[in-house]
Structures are given as C-alpha cells and as structure tokens.
C-alpha cells in the first residue's frame, strides 16, 4: 500500500554508544521525506526528526529518560512537498525498527586511561569515568553511575621490552598492579559487562606506556 512515489524505509538499525543513540535506515530519499516516532512498549508514540531528508535520527534525548526501558521506533515515508498525502490504507508507509533496550545493548565506548602512577614496585592505573548523556537530578551520570557493578574493567599490561601480557580486573575504575623495578610497562584497558549476552566488551583503549607524558613516577 502507499502512494506510488514513496517507498518504505528499510534496514532500520540502532547505533548506540555510551547511550548516545541514533536510528539509521535506508534508502537515501528521492522525492520523499521521513518522520520518526519512538515509544516504550507501554507508552505513547513521540514524533522526532520531522519531515527530514536525512536517513538518521538522534533519539538520545528520548532513550536517556529511562535506559532500562525497551524502545521501538518507526520511520514514516511521505512524498516530498505533499506530507499530508497518505497511502491507500489511509496512513503513510512506515517500517518498524527492532526493539532496543539501551541498558542491555548500548555499545561500550572505547575507554581511556586517565593516569598511571608508579610508587616503588606498584603502579596505580586509573580509567577515566566517561560522562554519559543520562541525567539524574539535573546532572549527567558517568558510565559507572549508570552501570554500577555491572561494569568491570580489564587491564592488559606488559613490559615494554617483551610481548607477554598479564591481565587484572576491577569492579571500580582503578587497578593496583605489581611491577618489576626499573622496567617500563605499557597498559591498555577494556570495559566489560559480563552479565550481557550482546555487546559485552568495548574496544581496547589506546596503549599508554611508562616513560611517556601521562604517567608519574615516585620512589
């Protein structure tokens, strides 16, 4: 059904990292425009990105209201310049997105090593607690604020002079590891949510090595 000069959107895909969430779809419009609606399973539809020629819509503001909810979106197609026109069934063509639960599915962004400090044969490594767009009481929550203990970090570390990697894990954003005196080490971290079935791990952080700017050494 639908007017002869509109086609339904397809390949609706959620692209979400640290709760920054964009719905993407195809095709690039030819003589048509799109409007997106989003809803929770039990809620009302809310329209976003009205009559756009883009093939993406930022839905972050909606999903951060409750990241534990499951959301559904749909993309309506309208003839360009005649957005009141409807299909033969009395409403414009539309396509539904897959369901999306931000807490369970948003990708974990690449973490960053904030600092490392050596004291004797111990090195304290701190992971930056990245701010998200999730708000509570008018403040933006960090990744740790949102995920709590569901989020762990894995540290990979190795002597600059060798390739043998060791690992440590933490339920906080800090590590305290033993190192050999006089040796320089390199570090990389990864965010992990072990309880997840999808998108469990982030990509590895950029490698940081002792003897470079970010660290600090104390006897």
């Amino acid at each position: 059904s639908g007017t002869t000069n509109t086609v339904a959107a397809y390949n609706l895909t959620w692209k979400s990292t640290n709760f920054k969430t964009i719905l993407e779809w195809e095709p690039k419009p030819v003589n048509q425009v799109y409007t997106v609606q989003i809803s929770t399973k039990s809620g009302d539809w809310k329209s976003k990105c009205f009559y756009t020629t883009d093939t993406e819509c930022d839905l972050t503001d909606e999903i951060v209201k409750d990241v534990n909810q499951t959301y559904l979106a749909r993309v309506f197609s309208y003839p360009a310049g005649n957005v009141e026109s409807t299909g033969s069934a009395g409403e414009p063509l539309y396509e539904n997105s897959p369901e999306f639960t931000p807490y369970l599915e948003t990708n974990l962004g690449q973490p960053t090593i904030q600092s490392f400090e050596q004291v004797g044969t111990k090195v304290n490594v701190t992971v930056e607690d990245e701010r998200t767009l999730v708000r509570r009481n008018n403040t933006f929550l960090s990744l740790r604020d949102v995920f709590g203990k569901d989020l762990i970090y894995t540290l990979y570390y190795w002597k600059s002079s060798s390739s043998g990697k060791k690992t440590a894990k933490t339920n906080t954003n800090e590590f305290l590891i033993d190192v050999d005196k006089g040796e320089n080490y390199c570090f990389s971290v990864q965010a992990v949510i072990p309880s997840r079935t999808v998108n469990r791990k982030s990509t590895d952080s950029p490698v940081e090595c002792m003897g470079q700017e970010k660290g600090e050494f104390r006897e």
């Epitope: 509570r136 709590g148 540290l155 440590a168 894990k169 339920n171 906080t172 305290l176 033993d178």
Partner: antibody, heavy 125, light 108 residues
C-alpha cells in the same frame, strides 16, 4: 567510622508494603560504595535482597524484583527498602550493609564490611 | 543462581582444635568475589575473609581461606572461645548474590 542503623515498623499486615530506612553516619553515602539490604528468616541463612549506588543504579534479587524498590536520599544520607504485597514468608530480620571496595589481585572488588544491627519485621494480621 | 553448599552443617569441636569448613559452589566462582562471614547469636554478620583468602583488617591470623573454582575452605587453626559461631560463605560476582546455608561451630 561508618555506622548503619535500620528503622521502620516492626509489624506489617499481609498484603501491605514493608518500608525500612537505613541511616548512614560517620561517612557519606555518596563516597563510592554500594548500599545493600539483606534479610534472615528466623533460624535460617542470609538472603541478599538488593543494592543501590548513590547515583540510583540498582541491582535486585530476581526472586524479589517484582516487589522490591531500593532508593537513596543523598541529602539525608539514607537509603530505603520497600517490599510490597508482603506475606508471612517475609517475616525476617532485615539488615542494611555497606558494600565497600577492597584490593585483591590487581583490582578492587566489593564486600559487605559494615552492617547495621538488624531490625525484626513480622508480617501478621 | 549460584548455589553455595556448606558442610558440615554443624561442627562440634573443643577450644584449641582445628576447624575446617567447606563451601562448594554449583558453578565456578571467581575467587575475587568469594567471602566468608561470621555471625554470633543476636548479631549481624562480620566480614572475615574476602577474595577467598585475604583476611579483613583486624581478623586474627588463625583464620585462613583457600580454594578456587567450585571448592573453597575456611580454616580456623586453633579455636578460641570467641570463635564458636555460625560461618557463611558468600559469592558476590553473579546476581543474585548468594550465601551458603552456614556451618555452626559449637563447643563439644
């Protein structure tokens, strides 16, 4: 040092909501620890109910999740437990506890190191 | 959920004797998340051991923990009168966090 004190009614009628508050003294509830509720049925073992972070992030025992709400009030340095639709099976000693990070094996992990004295809640008409 | 089974249910010993308490998990538990608690009548539990083997500050060195995977042990090398209590193992790695059923160490 940090101390915890549970408060709330000792008697709750069946089908009503059990409400308890835990007051944290000697430290800030916003200082990077988690705050838990645990209960112990008469003469029995311990059952974890759930936990909350100062940000409001919660984790609940799935067996109780549909009836449990844990909330935090940072301005009062308190966190609270609500358990709805109670029955006699909810009669227990209810404890609040602090879940604090301890160093182990290169990282930090959380353990319940400070507990309240516990408060007995009886569900009866 | 991870079920923790403690044995024996009751251990009858005399002061000065060695107590060995077992905690077996229904599936593998990361040692980082395994703790032991002591509870005396009318009191709240007290953290003794964390990370399966690390003593909490102020806990006497007669208490020691060991084990990995599914089998963990709490050992009290020489029982003192104040050690007679109920001991619980707990895992805090997988929700729901679970406790064992407890082992009561009583005076023989």
């Amino acid at each position: 040092q940090v101390q915890l004190q549970e408060s709330g009614p000792g008697l709750v009628k069946p089908s009503q909501t059990l409400s308890l508050t835990c007051t944290v003294s000697g430290g800030s509830i916003s200082s990077g620890q988690y705050w838990s509720w645990i209960r112990q049925h008469p003469g029995k073992g311990l059952e974890w109910i759930g936990e909350i972070y100062y940000s409001g992030s919660t984790r609940y025992n799935p067996s109780l999740k549909s009836r449990v709400t844990i909330s935090v009030d940072t301005s009062k340095n308190q966190f609270s437990l609500k358990l709805s639709s109670v029955t006699a099976a909810d009669t227990a000693v209810y404890y609040c506890a602090r879940d604090a990070p301890y160093y182990y094996g290169g990282g930090y992990y959380y353990y319940m190191d400070v507990w309240g004295k516990g408060t007995t809640v009886t569900v009866s008409s | 959920e991870i079920v923790l089974t403690q044995s024996p249910g009751t251990l009858s010993l005399s002061p000065g004797e060695r107590a060995t308490l077992s905690c077996r998990a229904s599936e593998s538990v990361d040692s980082s998340y395994l703790a032991w608690y002591q509870q005396k009548p009318g009191q709240a539990p007290r953290l003794l051991i964390y990370g399966a083997s690390t003593r909490q500050t102020g806990i006497p060195d007669r208490f020691s923990g060991s084990g990995s995977g599914t089998d963990f042990t709490l050992t009290i090398s020489r029982l003192e009168p104040e050690d007679f209590a109920v001991y619980y193992c707990q895992q805090a790695g997988v929700v729901p966090y679970t406790f064992g059923g407890g082992t009561k160490v009583e005076i023989k």
